[in-house]
């Protein structure tokens, strides 16, 4: 039975040209995290395997930095980066947990971080 929950940074906004940390956290389970995949719609951004380290998709390699932790830092933001991002936690023995983050990249300097929220 899957008992865990994914806590994410929720709805966040950032300035064009700036950077943002995409972060998820798996709690309420003793399952072992074997890998975390970061995806944007149908695009793979990065994979962090607990033993094999990081894979960064070549289309993002100049703008994505691994970490902190299992998170992902997205740099040199453009308006086109606005959209949904998913952290997909592959765990043993529970299986897969998915968290969602919505990022809005703003032209202006008025960018505020949203509240954290949980996805069961």
């Amino acid at each position: 039975m899957m008992t865990g929950t994914i806590e994410t940074t929720g709805n966040i906004s950032a300035e064009k040209g700036g950077s943002i940390i995409l972060q998820c956290h798996l709690s309420s389970t003793t399952a072992q995290v074997t890998q975390v995949n970061w995806e944007q719609q149908d695009q793979l951004l990065a994979i962090c395997n607990a033993d094999l380290g990081w894979h960064i998709s070549p289309s993002f390699k100049d703008r994505v930095a691994p970490g902190p932790g299992l998170g992902l830092t997205l740099q040199s933001l453009t308006v086109n980066d606005t959209g949904e991002y998913f952290c997909i936690y592959h765990t043993y023995p529970d299986g897969t947990y998915t968290g969602r983050i919505f990022l809005e990249v703003l032209e202006s300097s008025v960018a505020e971080h949203g509240a954290r929220f949980q996805i069961p």
Partner: antibody, heavy 119, light 107 residues
């Protein structure tokens, strides 16, 4: 120039073990993971597992877990794969392979080591 | 485990022809797919990574496409030296898995 030099062919008896080496050169050994791939009948490829030479962390294909052991010797920049309790199904060519920088695709391969299990 | 299916074990083509080799994943693997060429008696050689990126030094007649579950490897104009087995591989999730291989034969 990156090179992965594997040990020579092996003829072993059923039930025995084999240990294959993969000596690397031309890059910083601890900065890249090393993987092992089995090829049976000259066609099908199977990922056995990979090892992070920096910290010794390993990831195994469940099919080989318990029978395969991946190790490294950082001082000689050499990776090893030991396979135990061999049967005729283990007769194959075994490759070591190194992925790219922040990329899991395997861009450098050893020349392969042929293992024949026969009584 | 994710199963990678290359439906054609053999493909016969002529020099100058365009050929498409397909690979289907049993579940979505985004763009985490590589293609390898293996000539007789040699080790596999990386041609395409992340579904559509050509590896350094690979001729531009080789291209890859696809996302999710369906992937295609294309040789736009087959040369005699392209006689080989072509393997797809997913690295979306361990265990990394390969297709059964497609042997390209030149008529």
């Amino acid at each position: 120039e990156v090179q992965l030099q594997q040990s020579g062919p092996e003829l072993v008896k059923p039930g025995a073990s084999v240990k294959i080496s993969c000596k690397t050169s031309g890059y910083t050994f601890t900065e890249y993971t090393m993987h092992w791939v089995k090829q049976s009948h000259g066609k099908n490829l199977e990922w056995i597992g990979g090892i992070n030479p920096n910290n010794g962390g390993t990831s195994y294909n469940q099919k080989f877990k318990g029978r395969a052991t991946l190790t490294v010797d950082k001082s000689s920049s050499t990776a090893y794969m030991e396979l135990r309790s061999l049967t005729s199904d283990d007769s194959a060519v075994y490759y070591c392979a190194r992925p790219g920088w922040y990329n899991y695709a395997m861009d450098y391969w050893g020349q392969g080591t042929s293992v024949t299990v026969s009584s | 485990d994710i199963v990678m299916t290359q439906s054609h074990k053999f493909m016969s083509t002529s020099v100058g022809d365009r050929v498409n080799i397909t690979c289907k994943a049993s579940q979505g693997v985004s763009t985490a797919v590589a293609w390898y060429q293996q000539k007789p008696g040699q080790s596999p050689k990386l041609l395409i990574y992340s579904a559509s990126y050509r590896y350094t030094g690979v001729p531009d007649r080789f291209t890859g496409s696809g996302s999710g579950t369906d992937f295609t490897f294309t040789i736009s104009s087959v040369q005699a030296e392209d006689l080989a087995v072509y393997h797809c591989q997913q690295h979306y999730i361990t265990p990394w898995t390969f297709g059964g291989g497609t042997k390209l034969e030149i008529k």
